[in-house]
Amino acid sequence: EEELQVIQPDKSVLVAAGETATLRCTATSLIPVGPIQWFRGAGPARELIYNQKEGHFPRVTTVSESTKRENMDFSISISNITPADAGTYYCVKFRKGSPDTEFKSGAGTELSVRAKPSAPVVSGPAARATPQHTVSFTCESHGFSPRDITLKWFKNGNELSDFQTNVDPVGESVSYSIHSTAKVVLTREDVHSQVICEVAHVTLQGDPLRGTANLSETIRVPPTLEVTQQPVRAENQVNVTCQVRKFYPQRLQLTWLENGNVSRTETASTVTENKDGTYNWMSWLLVNVSAHRDDVKLTCQVEHDGQPAVSKSHDLKVSAHPKEQGSNTAAENTGSNERNIY
């Protein structure tokens, strides 16, 4: 009689994560008597997947009734497949004895698992940066298989080219991770901008996953200052305004100095928002010039988002103060912060 052969007809099987894998195996003879065992891998590190004779294998079911004496179909199904199940599976016939000894192995079936990448997570720099600076964004996605994957970066829909991507590990693995770093040059108009990381993988059926980062969390647009003297409101009173324009984020503190001495400090509250997402604010100071013998140097000092203060000064001539000096050039800016100096 011809010697028993163990036939594994499928060289490879491809299964999506979460599904059930069926691994086929048949024997060509009932002799010798003895059980079948399934292993993942070969050599000393091979793992026992199923033992027909004994043991508890909750994820494994036999396709046919393997307990019947005349049965020669030793196919198994493994439920709830994960990337960790990938590998080559061997159906091995044992000869009954004390103990049973390995008799013949099938050629093996390679199980490949398709697993979706996790939603990409985009993270920006720890500290804010100002326009014209280059900042780095990272994008990470994990747990996908097979290894082939495509990652693209966009800023407001425009594809970026300055990025570096790594897929780990380099060698064979049950699943993979991707890590990419993109460099983005900030502009003053980026408060409303978005950076998008897009990941395409065979498991996603042409519907890529996206991760986003808002540049509003990354950018700091420093303010521009303008100090102007408004028309006189009443005899001996001069109205000085400090226009704080185009700043982001809103966190801003303004201090008025009179000849270098602190006169008043206030925090930006009623701001107006520009179309580009930046803010404007205006502070007024009502100066009683009759209380001064000499000229007054008024300084508007602004500390924005914890950065070193910037300032703009205005010299108020006490000797000659015409009724109209300067003009309100920013009609859209409103503020009502009045203070007399005595």
């Epitope: 065992q37 292993f39 050599g43 000393p44 590190a45 091979r46 793992e47 026992l48 103990p99 000894t101 390995e102 590990p169 693995s173």
Partner: antibody
Framework: EVQFQQSGTVLARPGTSVKMSCKAS????????MHWVKQGPGQGLQWIGA????????TYNQKFKGKAELTVVTSTSTAYMEVSSLTNEDSAVYYC???????????????WGQGTLVTVSA | DIQMTQSPSSLSASLGERVSLTCRAS??????LNWLQQEPDGTIKRLIY???SLDSGVPKRFSGSRSGSDYSLTISGLESEDFVDYYC?????????FGGGTKLEIN
């Protein structure tokens, strides 16, 4: 009780070969892979390879392919390792140990032979 | 090949002290790690298998644990016979690899 008895100390000339043995007792020889491990003087442990007595299947560390050859005689429950083309680098203690026929945690490298000292000298 | 980086390579400690030896795996090995003890005469004995399972006959002062890719052997309350060499071994995939060893010396 499981025991591995290894052959005695060997003094060999460079360029020659040595064949050492490891006799297993106390359990079923054919249910286990027999492994060999090298330890150079004052050095750590290096896995050489393993053999499965049922079908003489062997697996080697790439570093020892062509240097070591593993064989078994099932009837005497003895594993052998031959180390060829000896150089000073082959002077070491060689240990045998075992693992189950599949990767069973509790059975990995539990029992060890006492080691065979090989000294290569002109 | 999976690299097993063992630290420290030598360690001086006093009787009764608690010490920890660490092995870091370069790739995922799951829980497939043994800790071995080697006497000065060359005798090798397994202490721990599967990262944290204690072999029978091994004193309870020996314990194994894992944090990510770092595997530790802790000896709480050193006794005189513990001042020998220790090795970790990964048996997750071939070639099976050992850590470089730790020589535990008495202070």
């Amino acid at each position: 009780e499981v025991q591995f008895q290894q052959s005695g100390t060997v003094l060999a000339r460079p360029g020659t070969s040595v064949k050492m043995s490891c006799k297993a007792s106390g359990s079923t020889f054919t249910s286990y892979w027999m492994h060999w491990v090298k330890q150079g003087p004052g050095q750590g442990l290096q896995w050489i390879g393993a053999i499965y007595p049922v079908n003489n299947d062997t697996t080697y560390n790439q570093k020892f392919k062509g240097k070591a050859e593993l064989t078994v005689v099932t009837s005497t429950s003895t594993a052998y390792m031959e180390v060829s083309s000896l150089t000073n680098e082959d002077s070491a203690v060689y240990y045998c140990t075992r693992s189950f026929y599949y990767s069973l945690d509790a059975a990995w490298f539990v029992y060890w032979g006492q080691g065979t000292l090989v000294t290569v000298s002109a | 090949d999976i690299q097993m980086t063992q630290s420290p390579s030598s360690l001086s400690a006093s009787l009764g002290e608690r010490v920890s030896l660490t092995c870091r795996a370069s790739q995922d090995i799951g829980s497939r790690l043994n800790w071995l003890q080697q006497e000065p005469d060359g005798t090798i004995k397994r202490l721990i298998y599967a990262t944290s399972s204690l072999d029978s006959g091994v004193p309870k002062r020996f314990s194994g644990s894992r944090s990510g890719s770092d595997y530790s052997l802790t000896i709480s309350g050193l006794e005189s016979e513990d001042f020998v060499d220790y090795y970790c071994l990964q048996y997750a995939s071939s070639p099976f690899t050992f850590g470089g060893g730790t020589k535990l010396e008495i202070n």
